[in-house]
Interface confidence: medium
Amino acid sequence: APYWTRPERMDKKLLAVPAANTVRFACPAAGNPTPSISWLKNGREFRGEHRIGGIKLRHQQWSLVMESVVPSDRGNYTCVVENKFGSIRQTYTLDVLERSPHRPILQAGLPANQTAVLGSDVEFHCKVYSDAQPHIQWLKHVEVNGSKVGPDGTPYVTVLKSWISESVEADVRLRLANVSERDGGEYLCRATNFIGVAEKAFWLSVHGP
């Protein structure tokens, strides 16, 4: 009966691929007599004329290649390997990721304004959604030589924290310990990606015990 020659490399059942890229499904097999391979998409016979751009079937490599994948290529792809003594099959799932990037989105209502007692600890919370890797910053408005804005009208700010987020959804926190009156004022949670910027201003008021 047919058998897989690289079963340890066939455990990746889901391929999530950005649109426009190339996908190859492979089911390396052997048997005596040499088995044949055929392909199904969502349980039905799959042939080149079933997709724009066609497909490449490489029987010697036990593979199916699709170039420039599009969302309609999503589905379950099954290789069926058989000879007169039996058949084996493997199913891969293809997800095609569409690229419709947008500027970051900040969850409404966060961060919230807070009032704190002198010497206490305060934590602000900002939730960022971005399909493109965002640069996230916590900023505080400051005065320079008694002025809140520069000559070009841009507010003076100091960067408290800055990093690139690896995730699509970032739950970020700014912790201020042992606050003093100096910590009072206007702050910003800002997220930037290559599409644009999103920011939310919030206030911290500090008062005596």
């Epitope: 066939m10 426009a20 996908v23 190859r24 890797q133």
Partner: antibody
Framework: EVQLVQSGAEVKKPGASVKVSCKAS????????ISWVRQAPGQGLEWMGW????????NYAQKFQGRVTVTTDTSTSTAYMELRSLRSEDTAVYYC???????????????????WGQGTTVTVSS | QSVLTQPPSLSVAPGKTATFTCGGN??????VHWYRQKPGQAPVLVMY???ERPSGIPERMSGSNFGNTATLTITRVEAEDEADYYC???????????FGGGTKLTVLG
């Protein structure tokens, strides 16, 4: 027709910087990354770095880290490569190339370069 | 970081077969791409994922990749095949592109 068209030849003095542009046409710019590869006279291909046109991520070869910056302008479908602190050994032809992702169920993901610019000659000489 | 080794030169008579090799530790576990570069021109992708020919590349070209050696084969070599041939892998550990040193094909006669 899918094309990458690069800016013209440059002659620079040692210590200067050079910025080479690469304008893409004939395809959706943000669907493919851009790699930069250089070739010194009589030498082989040397990869410098790449940029994701989708999210601006960059990755540079160790040799060029800190001296090269690769950027993109999605509004004009143009990629840029800036090389600073030039020395005579930087004399080369600089190529941009479209990066295509190949996803393989057995071997995982791999990237290759399926379309290349015509090359920009940069000469560094005092 | 992957290191790819290619012989610097290869000479073949017209009509014969040219075999380019690209050596690397367990390269068979990676996917290899091949580029052809004619004098004064930009490189052109001629083979991807070890065995796949881009459109416009003749069937005379084929590829394989096993163990520690990837191979690009051109049958019925013609004068127009004279060029430098480079192998390339993607080092997924470092997200870096790695090229072999290239092989110069000379077509005799």
């Amino acid at each position: 027709e899918v094309q990458l068209v690069q800016s013209g030849a440059e002659v620079k003095k040692p210590g200067a910087s050079v910025k080479v542009s690469c304008k893409a046409s004939g395809y959706m710019f943000t669907s493919y990354g851009i790699s930069w590869v250089r070739q010194a006279p009589g030498q082989g291909l040397e990869w410098m770095g790449w940029v994701s046109t989708y999210n601006g991520d960059t990755n540079y070869a160790q040799k060029f880290q800190g001296r090269v910056t690769v950027t993109t302008d999605t509004s004009t479908s143009t990629a840029y490569m800036e090389l600073r602190s030039l020395r005579s050994e930087d004399t080369a032809v600089y190529y941009c190339a479209r990066v295509l992702g190949y996803y393989d169920s057995i071997d995982g993901y791999y990237y290759g370069m399926d379309v290349w610019g015509q090359g920009t000659t940069v000469t560094v000489s005092s | 970081q992957s290191v790819l080794t290619q012989p610097p030169s290869l000479s073949v008579a017209p009509g014969k077969t040219a075999t380019f090799t690209c050596g690397g530790n367990n390269i068979g576990d990676k996917s290899v791409h091949w580029y052809r570069q004619k004098p004064g021109q930009a490189p052109v992708l001629v083979m991807y994922l070890d065995t796949e020919r881009p459109s416009g590349i003749p069937e005379r070209m084929s590829g394989s990749n096993f163990g520690n050696t990837a191979t690009l084969t051109i049958t019925r070599v013609e004068a127009e095949d004279e060029a430098d041939y480079y192998c390339q892998v993607w080092d997924s550990g470092s997200d870096h592109v790695v090229f072999g040193g290239g092989t110069k094909l000379t077509v005799l006669g």
